[in-house]
């Protein structure tokens, strides 16, 4: 038993990260691998992660952790029985993916102007809270082609647009994404999506 | 906004002890490291010891072999310091510093105005 | 207990100049550093943490650098409101130890 793709692994920051790897050969990944991840500090202690399955031959570890700050560095022993198949390390705050934003809504009561809103995946007391910038992605499912992206790169988890960009009588559904600059993130998941029917009032034409 | 307001100068006796006040306002006070130190005139800040509000939990510099504890009133967000067995030595602005959820985040991004201790005789 | 040394422990530069601190742990801290500044009167105020992580509101100007002993602050370009005294101080399990302090004065 071999690894034919070495562990690599993301954190969200916050509470879990998340590591893939690929074996040579289809693997139970949960009854014949262990992962132990050891924080590189004053007394801290070893921890098992038991992987899941990721396709036939790949596996993906969820590693608890209580909490990052930006020092933080972690050994990783990737065991299957009693051999040791492969080792390394990994600092959380270089390998950030930030949590996927929530509880997206489109607020269309607002005279002909969309307002769009989620919620900050992080508590105000963690670094990321402070730090995050969005992606808006919003479609039509009626026309492939009309897709667009806002960047939002203020603090403020929300977008204002008017109505009247977007085509008036058909379905529009949006989804958001975050990351974060200053640790140089890859974007988050993106949220769960939501559905409006985009209405507005069609100026008069003048004749 | 987050504010440590510390009380006020005290003079004391050698052999004396002296408790010192920190009120903590703006933040979940049970959620954080509550740290001492001090700073003698001239001389490199000295880190005394540290509560952990939530549970009780402290942590002492033994360099003060007993004659420093740190305590709380959760009920009104307010950390204590007391210094017993006082010397000249000891004469040092105080002051109390707000570190982190857990120990290895103990960084001090807030602190208190400083409370001036004199011991003379 | 750590000790941290710092170098050197007073500077004199001017506006403009490009300032380096450095201070040095007694055994390995891995990341767990951080910068302080202090004006005379007043509480240190945190600059960087975990080394190079520049605190809330810092100005780009400073940073940090360094692992394991040897640690930087850098001052880009000095500007007046800078001229205080630095302390490092690391994290690495208690006892909590700060260096002995570098003032920098106007030339």
């Known amino acids: 038993m071999k690894v034919l793709q070495e562990p690599t692994c993301v954190s969200d920051y916050m509470s879990i990260s998340t590591c893939e790897w690929k074996m040579n050969g289809p693997t139970n990944c949960s009854t014949e691998l262990r992962l132990l991840y050891q924080l590189v500090f004053l007394l801290s202690e070893a921890h098992t992660c038991i992987p899941e399955n990721n396709g036939g031959a790949g596996c993906v570890c969820h590693l608890l952790m209580d909490d990052v700050v930006s020092a933080d560095n972690y050994t990783l022993d990737l065991w299957a029985g009693q051999q040791l198949l492969w080792k390394g390390s990994f600092k959380p705050s270089e390998h950030v993916k930030p949590r996927a934003p929530g509880n997206l809504t489109v607020h269309t009561n607002v005279s002909d102007t969309l307002l769009l809103t989620w919620s900050n995946p992080y508590p105000p007391d963690n670094y990321l809270y402070n730090h995050l910038t969005y992606a808006v992605n919003i479609w039509s499912e009626n026309d492939p082609a009309d897709f667009r992206i806002y960047n939002v790169t203020y603090l403020e988890p929300s977008l204002r647009i008017a109505a009247s960009t977007l085509k008036s009588g058909i379905s529009y559904r949006a989804r958001v994404r975050a990351w974060a600059q200053c640790y140089n993130t890859t974007w988050s998941e993106w949220s769960p999506s939501t559905k409006w029917h985009n209405s507005y009032r069609e100026p008069f034409e003048q004749h | 906004e987050v504010q440590l307001v510390q009380s006020g100068a005290e003079v004391k006796k050698p052999g004396a002890s002296v408790k010192v006040s920190c009120k903590a306002s703006g933040y979940t006070f049970t959620s954080y490291n509550m740290h001492w130190a001090r700073q003698a005139p001239g001389q490199r800040l000295e880190w005394m010891g540290s509560i952990y509000p939530g549970n009780g939990d402290t942590s002492y510099n033994q360099k003060f072999k007993g004659r420093v504890t740190i305590t709380v009133d959760k009920s009104a967000s307010t950390a204590y310091m007391e210094l017993s067995s006082l010397r000249s030595e000891d004469t040092a602005v105080y002051y109390c510093?707000?570190?982190?959820?857990?120990?290895?985040?103990?960084?001090?991004?807030?602190w208190g105005q400083g409370t001036l201790v004199t011991v003379s005789s | 207990d750590i000790q941290m040394t710092q170098s050197p422990s007073s500077l004199s530069a001017s506006v403009g100049d490009r300032v380096t601190i450095t201070c040095r742990a007694s055994?390995?801290?891995?990341?767990?550093l951080i910068w302080y500044q202090q004006k005379p009167g007043k509480a240190p105020k945190l600059l960087v943490y975990?080394?190079?992580t520049l605190a809330e509101g810092v100005p780009s100007r400073f940073s940090g650098s360094g692992s394991g002993t040897d640690f930087t602050l850098t001052i880009s370009s000095l500007q007046p409101e800078d001229f205080a005294t630095y302390y490092c101080?690391?994290?690495?399990?208690?006892?909590?130890?700060f260096g002995g302090g570098t003032k920098v004065e106007i030339k």
């Open positions: 510093a707000r570190g982190g959820r857990l120990r290895r985040g103990d960084w001090f991004a807030y």
């Open positions: 975990d080394a190079k």
């Open positions: 055994e390995n801290i891995y990341s767990y």
């Open positions: 101080q690391h994290h690495y399990g208690t006892p909590l130890t």
